[in-house]
């Protein structure tokens, strides 16, 4: 015998209290697949979270983070404080990158400057706290007497893609 609940589409639930008829999900709840016996409570984007997509009867709300914070975890389960370019977030707050490391975004960690010599290249542009080095040609490609290192480009607002 076919389960009568299998006829209930997304956005409804199979209501045992009403002889297994398909009832619409109550306000602030949803069912994203058919044949559900209950509707799930909608996620609420509160505090540092803000609503990116409203809840509907067939899909959950989606949250992102208020300005100054960025998403972490699957489905933006957490919001983490932004730092400035040239910094990383530690337990004690935002700290400048140590010499030899950089962070060109508002999130994430300070990473070591690229070691150009690993690729047999020279340093074309020095690194800063905000920027990686730019590797240039191999030292053998440089003309005699040519200076190989350019001063770093001025720091600028990083491109970062909140996630």
């Amino acid at each position: 015998l076919q389960d009568p609940c299998s006829n209930c589409p997304a956005g409804t639930f199979c209501d045992n209290n009403r002889n297994q008829i398909c009832s619409p999900c109550p306000p602030n709840s949803f069912s994203s697949a058919g044949g559900q016996r209950t509707c799930d409570i909608c996620r609420q984007c509160k505090g540092v979270f803000r609503t990116r997509k409203e809840c509907s009867s067939t899909s959950n709300a989606e949250c992102d983070c208020t300005p100054g914070f960025h998403c972490l975890g699957a489905g933006c389960s957490m919001c983490e404080q932004d730092c400035k370019q040239g910094q990383e977030l530690t337990k004690k707050g935002c700290k400048d990158c140590c010499f030899g490391t950089f962070n060109d975004q508002k999130r994430g960690i300070c990473r070591p400057w690229t070691n150009c010599s690993l690729d047999g290249k020279s340093v074309l542009v020095n690194g800063t706290k905000e920027r990686d080095v730019v590797c240039g040609p191999s030292p053998a490609d440089l003309s005699p007497g040519a200076s190989s290192v350019t001063p770093p480009a001025p720091a600028r607002e990083p491109g970062h893609s909140p996630q």
Epitope: D104, Q105, G108, I109, R111, W113, T114, N115, C116, L118, D119, K121, L124, V125, R131, D132, V133, V134, C135, G136, A153, P154, R156, E157, P158, G159, H160, S161, Q163
Partner: antibody
């Protein structure tokens, strides 16, 4: 020599997912960013996102944030990009690329993987 | 996002001609401007990085110049093997963005 070898062409139905691979060789995989770039038929190039295989740190173009998931497997020196909920506008050639010394230009490119979405 | 305005979208020139392509970002990108060549078979190659630096192995007829919001790519003497589409790309700010491309044909 540095090589990025991508998986073969795929034909998928709307709503399906596809996972494209990019196997790197000839360099230390964990030390360079791998980027993914889209080229729709007759169109220009669009940056989708990148990954730093050492710690799997990713950046995404907001436009592709809900479409693409980029991962990397250090043990096989392979990067992956999964595209979900495929639609006809996802029909394109997808390239993986490596950065040049630092993550601001792309010095090596894979041969491209054609993904066709058709019912 | 930074918009990259590349011109012309196509051009036809003769072997030996000097060819110039321009790229104008919508905001200052310092020197983080790169040029790529895409052959008809889809193969993509980096030619110029950091505005003017010729990638190792690339012929010296290719060159680049500019800074900030105005960049130029030049082929000093066009060769038959230069038939391709050329793209500029900014590496200053995420998301990285490309120009729409210049399709180069031989007269």
């Amino acid at each position: 020599q540095v090589q990025l070898v991508q998986s073969g062409a795929e034909v998928k139905k709307p709503g399906a997912s596809v996972k494209v691979s990019c196997k790197a060789s000839g360099y230390t995989f964990t030390s360079y960013w791998i980027n993914w770039v889209k080229q729709a038929p007759g169109q220009g190039l669009e940056w989708i996102g990148n990954i730093y295989p050492s710690d799997s740190y990713t950046n995404y173009n907001q436009k592709f944030k809900d479409k693409a998931t980029i991962t990397a497997d250090k043990s096989t020196s392979t990067a992956y990009m999964e595209l979900s909920s495929l639609r006809s506008e996802d029909t394109a050639v997808y390239y993986c690329t490596r950065d040049y010394g630092s993550s601001y230009s792309f010095d090596y490119w894979g041969q491209g993987t054609t993904v066709t979405v058709s019912s | 996002d930074i918009q990259m305005t590349q011109s012309p979208s196509s051009l036809s020139a003769s072997v030996g001609d000097r060819v110039t392509i321009t790229c104008r970002p919508s905001q200052d990108i310092s020197n983080y401007l790169n040029w790529y060549q895409q052959k008809p078979d889809g193969t993509v190659k980096l030619l110029i990085y950091y505005t003017s630096r010729l990638r190792s192995g690339v012929p010296s007829r290719f060159s680049g110049s500019g800074s900030g919001t105005d960049f130029t790519f030049t082929i000093s003497s066009l060769q038959p093997e230069d038939i391709a589409t050329y793209f500029c790309q900014q590496g200053d700010t995420l998301p990285y963005t490309f120009g729409q491309g210049t399709k180069l044909e031989i007269k």
